[in-house]
Amino acid sequence: NECPKLQPPVYGKIEPSQAVYSFKDQVLVSCDTGYKVLKDNGVMDTFQIECLKDGAWSNKIPTCKIVDCGAPAGLKHGLVTFSTRNNLTTYKSEIRYSCQQPYYKMLHNTTGVYTCSAHGTWTNEVLKRSLPTCLPVCGQPSRALPNLVKRIIGGRNAELGLFPWQALIVVEDTSRVPNDKWFGSGALLSESWILTAAHVLRSQRRDNTVIPVSKEHVTVYLGLHDVRDKSGAVNSSAARVILHPDFNIQNYNHDIALVQLQKPVPLGAHVMPICLPRPEPEGPAPHMLGLVAGWGISNPNVTVDEIILSGTRTLSDVLQYVKLPVVSHAECKASYESRSGNYSVTENMFCAGYYEGGKDTCLGDSGGAFVIFDEMSQHWVAQGLVSWGGPEECGSKQVYGVYTKVSNYVDWLWEEMNSPRAVRDLQVER
């Protein structure tokens, strides 16, 4: 009643290993690490067989099959490459996830290397079974912005891709008779969020009252260079319009707002976000040079069709930029106090421009970002938003442009963008 001697499967073993197996003896077939028992198209960790009364084994010895992790999952804004020849997906094979550079960067700076584990899952040393996250790269235009040593007076044409965060905001307030139309600028913060000035998104229908425009009345254009040709631009409607709750229309304190886009926009050479500064009350230091871009829409009677389709009656069809130095708070405050008026340059504002004036102070559209290069992180950062002073007193002597100090609002911005009310949770990698 002895059963025949057993031969262990390739990449496997039999336990217990005996010289003789008699009736009722049982053996357990198992496979080496990275292999699984294959029996009748079923995969299992172990398989038990028994020596029967008639001297035969209850089952044939199964085979050991190498673990296969299968095709790796796709990565949003990224791609996967196989490190092993023939695109193998079996045990100990390697794959590498990478993000669509230079527009996306991997969160946590992981290697992106995943190995097929013995359990049949793609595994990373740090992230384990979780996939990496590709976040938008901010403040790194595909074209290098001009060095800031040379001073530019007045505006210069911006080459396509120099200010990929620049947004044109078009508002058509149909609740008014006649329909009201106006424009402003904004800056892309992520695939779904635009930063702008609150006054751009406030309806002037009621004085002394902050009435935000309806989201239905807002259109945002990104990747727009020449207002006469919007074919290459991405246009998006708004899902939410969020004005800072303390925005004051009398002195433009807290002049900051967000627009959440209806759908995330695809990033590319002409559409990339700007970085937010670190949350610090100081803001940019005096004499630091920053850039502001805008189409300088000077004629307010221009219609949406004219601006978007033909670009007529604007200061420039092509996006312009200007370089301006930050002015000390004390000097700016004094310059406005000397003008006799209810002007207050608060701690939530900073000023930029030249004492002798010039058209440079009015080129940036309201809501556009005043960007400064951060040497430490090697990114461009939105330190300010075009708020008041300059845009309406275009180039007057000793009338500095006043900008919203974005660093005072970083916590508020993140809070709003990550709140449950937001349609999506979004981050940006710096």
């Epitope: 106006w182 307010p300 006799s340 008026g341 008041w388």
Partner: antibody, heavy 116, light 112 residues
Framework: QIQLVQSGPELKKPGETVKISCKAS????????MSWVRQAPGKGLKWMGW????????TYADDFKGRFAFSLETSARTPYLQINNLKNEDTATYFC?????????WGQGTSVTVSS | DVLMTQTPLTLSVTIGQPASISCKSS???????????LNWLLQRPGQSPKRLIY???KLDSGVPDRFTGSGSGTDFTLKISRVEAEDLGVYYC?????????FGGGTKLEIK
């Protein structure tokens, strides 16, 4: 501190055109609309309409549609009222007032006399 | 258009005495936003108008507290607790709720 300074008096003939200015100072100009109000000699006040100083879009009361035009020179912080094809009944003092509806500060008024 | 009716047409008051002006609108001035855009202004002789009261009862800065505004819906009142010489002129109410905004005919306050 907040001031609206209007242009001087005008003497015009019927059929001519007049353009009145209203220079604003002491506040953020594009934050408030600007209204225009007419006061005929010895009469009360009549609201003509307003202009959105941010968008430049004018809104006219029905009685002032056609010959009347509001415009802006934002960089000079100056709204304008233009009356075309003047008639004798346009003889009045014209005021600009800050705000589309609030009208919290008023200009000193511009007297327009239309006489042949 | 909303008709604004002011009474009386003329008011003769002795200095130090109270005065009251009524303003009635042909329809309610309560706006959909919950506010009532009823305002009062004073036009002194030979001068431009000056706003005194907005949103029915809010006093403009620099306006003496002897002025009070009250009312709701279609009936509004401006009261002066003790008239002073500088108060003479024509008082107008106006509404900013229904387009186009309309003024009352004015009430001339003269000193007895």
């Amino acid at each position: 501190q907040i001031q609206l300074v209007q242009s001087g008096p005008e003497l015009k003939k019927p059929g001519e055109t007049v353009k009145i200015s209203c220079k604003a100072s002491g506040y953020i100009f594009t934050s408030y609309g600007m209204s225009w109000v007419r006061q005929a000699p010895g009469k009360g006040l009549k609201w003509m309409g307003w202009i959105n100083t941010y968008s430049g879009v004018p809104t006219y009361a029905d009685d002032f549609k056609g010959r009347f035009a509001f415009s802006l020179e934002t960089s000079a912080r100056t709204p304008y009222l233009q009356i075309n094809n003047l008639k004798n009944e346009d003889t009045a003092t014209y005021f600009c007032a800050r705000g589309g509806e609030a009208m919290d500060y008023w200009g000193q008024g511009t007297s327009v006399t239309v006489s042949s | 258009d909303v008709l604004m009716t002011q009474t009386p047409l003329t008011l003769s008051v002795t200095i130090g005495q109270p005065a009251s002006i009524s303003c009635k609108s042909s329809q309610s001035l309560l706006d959909s936003d919950g506010k009532t855009y009823l305002n009062w202004l004073l036009q002194r002789p030979g001068q431009s108008p000056k706003r005194l009261i907005y949103l029915v009862s809010k006093l403009d800065s620099g306006v003496p507290d002897r002025f009070t505004g009250s009312g709701s819906g279609t009936d509004f009142t401006l009261k002066i607790s003790r008239v002073e010489a500088e108060d003479l002129g024509v008082y107008y109410c106006w509404q900013g709720t229904h387009f186009p905004w309309t003024f009352g005919g004015g009430t001339k306050l003269e000193i007895k």
